[in-house]
């Protein structure tokens, strides 16, 4: 059965450059290993932001990536991207791969448009 990946269409990053959004897939397969990849689309280019493999025991992911974090619960991943600046505004896609046990499945969300506004610099005070 095909898997559907859903994610919010728009998210506004905080003033500290942090954006959080869920990535869910359905139906909920009985999967021991799920690989989640966050991709950024700019024009026709697609680049990997971060990727991790979640398991029943390893529900905290992206440990190798300083700007990404995420937690996995059943068929929902809560993603957080930090260190964002205005130039990072763009469409962020969630790709889900059901790795184990077989069969392998892949699904892609439609993307979350993350808007990042750089904070105004504090005025100098005498």
């Amino acid at each position: 059965e095909a898997i559907q990946v859903t994610q919010p269409s728009v998210v506004l990053a905080s003033s500290h450059g942090v954006a959080s959004f869920p990535c869910e897939y359905s139906p909920s397969h009985n999967t021991d290993e799920v690989r989640v990849t966050v991709l950024r689309q700019t024009n026709d280019q697609m680049t990997e932001v971060c990727a991790t493999t979640f398991t029943e025991k390893n529900t905290v992911g992206f440990l190798d990536y300083p700007f990404c974090s995420g937690t996995f619960n059943e068929s929902r991943v809560n993603l957080t991207i930090q260190g964002l600046r205005a130039v990072d505004t763009g469409l962020y896609l969630c790709k889900v791969e059901l790795m184990y046990p077989p069969p392998y499945f892949v699904g892609m969300g439609n993307g979350t448009q993350i808007y990042v506004i750089d904070p105004e610099p504090c005025p100098d005070s005498d």
Epitope: E1, A2, T37, L39, M46, T47, E48, K95, M99, Y100, P102, P103, Y104, F105, V106, G107, M108
Partner: antibody
Framework: QVQLVESGGGVVQPGRSLRLSCAAS????????MHWVRQAPGKGLEWVAV????????YYADSVKGRFTISRDDSKNTLYLQMSSLRAEDTAVYYC????????????????WGQGTLVTVSS | DIQMTQSPSSLSASVGDRVTITCRAS??????LNWYQQKPGKAPKLLIY???SLQSGVPSRFSGSGSGTDFTLTISSLQPEDFATYYC?????????FGPGTKVDIK
């Protein structure tokens, strides 16, 4: 240039075993997933198995599951297909094919193929 | 398993003709579809991946389109070297099944 050369085919009796090899050159073998695809005489293509670039995942067609094992030796730049309990319906040309292990939006595809090795299962 | 069907199973065409081959998946596979060309006694050759991306070195007369369950391979102006059998393949879910093939021969 990319080269894939299969070997190990031949005539084998039903129920026996055979190991196919695929020697790779012209690219960084350890960076690519690898597939086996077969083609029975006069028939279409049948996907057999895939192994991920790092060997972490292996997937098989239902028709060979439990009888065939895909493996790789990155130190020798070689892909293997261990075939056991062979049946007449396993008679085919077996191709190995290279696949980019990570394709962002494109899924997995075989971009280079060997010329194949013929396996005939007959008593 | 996802089943792939192709139509027509064979077709006769002349050099210069526009040729269209269709491939249908038994369930939605998004854009995870590849097209291959095979000539007798030769290994298959990748033409199109991800439904519409042209493989490097493949002539621009080949194009692919479609998403979901219905896909098309188009040869805009058939050349003598294009007479071959064409296969679609899904890479959405294992097993990565192929279609039965479409044989293009000379009218």
């Amino acid at each position: 240039q990319v080269q894939l050369v299969e070997s190990g085919g031949g005539v084998v009796q039903p129920g026996r075993s055979l190991r196919l090899s695929c020697a790779a050159s012209g690219f960084t073998f350890s960076s690519y997933g690898m597939h086996w695809v077969r083609q029975a005489p006069g028939k279409g293509l049948e996907w057999v198995a895939v192994i991920w670039y790092d060997g972490s995942y292996k997937y098989y067609a239902d028709s060979v599951k439990g009888r065939f094992t895909i493996s790789r030796d990155d130190s020798k730049n070689t892909l293997y297909l261990q075939m056991s309990s062979l049946r007449a319906e396993d008679t085919a040309v077996y191709y190995c094919a290279r696949a980019p292990h990570y394709a962002i939006l494109t899924g997995y595809y075989e971009d280079y193929w060997g010329q194949g090795t013929l396996v005939t299962v007959s008593s | 398993d996802i089943q792939m069907t192709q139509s027509p199973s064979s077709l006769s065409a002349s050099v210069g003709d526009r040729v269209t081959i269709t491939c249908r998946a038994s369930q939605s596979i998004s854009s995870y579809l590849n097209w291959y060309q095979q000539k007798p006694g030769k290994a298959p050759k990748l033409l199109i991946y991800a439904a519409s991306s042209l493989q490097s070195g493949v002539p621009s007369r080949f194009s692919g389109s479609g998403s979901g369950t219905d896909f098309t391979l188009t040869i805009s102006s058939l050349q003598p070297e294009d007479f071959a059998t064409y296969y679609c393949q899904q890479s959405y879910s294992t097993p990565f099944t192929f279609g039965p093939g479409t044989k293009v021969d000379i009218k």
